[in-house]
Interface confidence: low
């Protein structure tokens, strides 16, 4: 899920629902597990820069090395630069740490473009803004990477929070977060808030900065407002979900529902874009095409490779449609929708200084291992992975971007039968789960 | 108005290094990326990379990578290009231009600093 | 890498004369063309942006169109000052490359 390689002029939504509308639930979410409410310490400890990638500040070792890692949903290895590379400002020195211990095994990980391999061990690790614990836990040191690294990102690590499925080399090097629930008394669920730049970036410093929080052991209703709802994770590996509808300002894509999750939907902070399969991506595009035909944009906007750009103020957001995934809920037969802007599927370029214009990257892309939810998306929604009762919520975030005229969106319940015909069954093999890569 | 300024002509030995400025004046330095392209005689227009002024991002062509250092120092207004391990095949004169992001045009040039390799 | 190829090398034209070069790009870049005159030992000039907008203060004589792989730099009535070497540059990606050059003598 590395980022470099895979890492309105109408009020509210378009178009009534399609679908019965259930009566709403009297209470408004059911007991979460964890500490509730406020998670000070850990409010606003992720940085990054737009499109590369959001981290946390971890200390590895005795004394304490301080790193700053990627948080990436899509992986589940913790692994840090650990030897000098052009684009590290600095790595995990293991020979000046009196607590590292050598795994004496290896591990490689090729991408579909780039790579990393290592050395596996292990030593204490801690989250200065984070829960006051320090665990052991194991760390791939990365001694050797192609196009893993990303120049001027300010990251030196990944930390990987999905399941022990796809950790490398093989299932059985515990994940961190397994880690800290065990050796800890810290509840088994995180939550992401991710807060997109929100602004052409010629409004502040080019490359602008974005925050967000991570907030382990619980929920912090702070980072939210409205209700949270929840989709089952479907299998433990990635934290995979089911989407069993797609709407484009209100109109059904109409297809399949299996297509939408060919060959699996996962909840992915380290990529940038949200990645559809090929026939749901042409779909996808044709509708927003439509959709926003008062101006015409080069074909390549579309593939993600040239930017559309603006006078300074002007981007015309009202032409653009909101997209809307309906997720599989809870209860029997029903879903619910989360909806998002164009000022989160249009991503301000980061690498571009001009005081002219405001320019924009389409961040929805073609996918051939199934939908990706990026970024793009994860930048409009408070979610929570709870791992303990195995689902995922989603909240409209306190800190997403939106204008005067719409916001993002989490709405249900919707009536929706035969959800389960929507997961695709993947073929077991020896191959299923080589690729972690998303290109 | 408008302009880039390039520092004066070089003549250096093989297996050096030559370090040619650009300065900027009459428009913010930091609205704009700063490419450099280079000439040898008689030759063609080659690019060579990019500096944004803002953040100190690069990005360098595969022939020069590892040679090319392209830095800026924005209290002053100016860009340089360092291109290390000179060859006679580096005698050419180097222009930086500024481009602008909505067409990516190099609207304006330096006027080009000669730099002769020879031993 | 995307290669830039252009066409003729050279020609030869009299004043008053239309003047057209073509530009090909290896693959598609849409509309991402810019066109550059080059007097000798001087810096080169954007003249088109975008395959066909003209540059502010260049003579409305000169004009580009196409898109996808073929473009076309077209100089309607050259005069004395036109005399000179025009480059092709594709702006999409990196590294960003030139054609070759086209250079309009004087027959």
């Known amino acids: 899920t590395h980022l470099g390689i895979r890492l309105p002029l109408r009020s509210g939504l378009a178009g009534p629902p399609l679908g019965l509308r259930l009566p709403r639930e009297t209470d408004e979410e059911s007991e979460e597990p964890g500490r509730r409410g406020s998670f000070v310490e850990m409010v606003d400890n992720l940085r990054g820069k737009s499109g590369q990638g959001y981290y946390v500040e971890m200390t590895v070792g005795s004394p304490p090395q301080t790193l700053n890692i990627l948080v990436d949903t899509g992986s589940s290895n913790f692994a840090v630069g650990a030897a000098p590379h052009p684009f590290l400002h600095r790595y995990y020195q293991r020979q000046l740490s009196s607590t590292y211990r050598d795994l004496r095994k290896g591990v490689y990980v090729p991408y579909t473009q780039g790579k990393w391999e290592g050395e596996l061990g292990t030593d204490l690790v801690s989250i200065p803004h984070g829960p006051n614990v320090t665990v052991r836990a194991n760390i791939a040191a990365i001694t050797e990477s192609d196009k893993f690294f990303i120049n001027g990102s300010n990251w030196e690590g990944i930390l990987g929070l999905a399941y022990a499925e796809i950790a490398r080399p093989d299932d059985s090097l515990e994940p961190f977060f397994d880690s800290l629930v065990k050796q800890t008394h810290i509840p088994n669920i995180f939550s992401l808030q991710l807060c997109g730049a929100g602004f052409p970036l010629n409004q502040t410093e080019a490359l602008a900065s974005v925050g967000g929080s991570m907030i382990i052991g619980g929920i912090d209703h702070s980072l939210y407002t409205g209700r949270l709802w929840y989709t089952p994770i479907r299998r433990e590996w990635y934290y995979e979900v089911i989407i069993v509808r797609v709407e484009i300002n209100g109109q059904d894509l109409k297809m399949d529902c299996k297509e939408y999750n060919y060959d699996k939907s996962i909840v992915d902070s380290g990529t940038t874009n949200l990645r559809l399969p090929k026939k749901v991506f042409e779909a996808a595009v044709k509708s927003i095409k439509a959709a926003s035909s008062t101006e015409k944009f080069p074909d390549g906007f579309w593939l993600g490779e040239q930017l559309v750009c603006w006078q300074a103020g002007t981007t015309p957001w009202n032409i653009f449609p909101v997209i809307s995934l309906y997720l599989m809920g809870e209860v029997t037969n029903q879903s619910f929708r989360i909806t998002i802007l164009p000022q989160q599927y249009l991503r301000p370029v980061e690498d571009v200084a001009t005081s002219q214009d405001d320019c924009y990257k389409f961040a929805v892309s073609q996918s051939s291992t199934g939908t990706v939810m990026g970024a793009v998306i994860m930048e409009g929604f408070y979610v929570v992975f709870d791992r303990a009762r195995k689902r995922i919520g989603f909240a409209v975030s306190a800190c997403h971007v939106h204008d005067e005229f719409r916001t993002a969106a989490v709405e249900g319940p919707f009536v929706t039968a035969d959800m389960e015909d929507c997961g695709y069954n993947i073929p077991q093999t020896d191959e299923s789960t080589l690729m972690t890569g998303r290109a | 108005q408008v302009q880039l300024v390039q520092s004066g002509a070089e003549v250096k030995k093989p297996g050096a290094s030559v370090k040619v400025s650009c300065k900027a004046s009459g428009y913010t330095f930091t609205g704009y990326y700063m490419h450099w392209v280079r000439q040898a005689p008689g030759q063609g227009l080659e690019w060579m990379g990019s500096i944004n002024p803002n953040s100190g991002g690069t990005n360098y062509a595969q022939k020069f990578q590892g040679r090319v250092t392209m830095t800026r120092d924005t209290s002053i207004s100016t860009a340089y290009m360092e291109l290390s391990r000179l060859r006679s095949d580096d005698t050419a004169v180097y222009y930086c231009?500024?481009?602008?992001?909505?067409?990516?045009?190099?609207?304006?040039w330096g006027q080009g600093t000669t730099v002769t390799v020879s031993s | 890498d995307i290669q830039m190829t252009q066409s003729p090398s050279s020609l030869s034209a009299s004043v008053g004369d239309r003047v057209t070069i073509t530009c090909r790009a290896s693959q598609s870049i849409s509309s991402y063309l810019n066109w550059y005159q080059q007097k000798p030992g001087k810096a080169p000039k954007l003249l088109i942006y975008?395959?066909?907008s003209l540059q502010s203060g260049v003579p409305s004589r000169f004009s580009g169109s196409g898109s996808g792989t073929d473009f076309t730099l077209t100089i309607s009535s050259l005069q004395p000052e036109d005399f000179a070497t025009y480059y092709c540059?594709?702006?999409?990606?990196?590294?960003?490359?030139f054609g070759g050059g086209t250079k309009v003598e004087i027959k």
């Open positions: 231009a500024r481009v602008r992001v909505r067409h990516y045009g190099m609207d304006v």
């Open positions: 540059q594709q702006p999409l990606s990196h590294p960003r490359t």
């Open positions: 975008a395959a066909s």
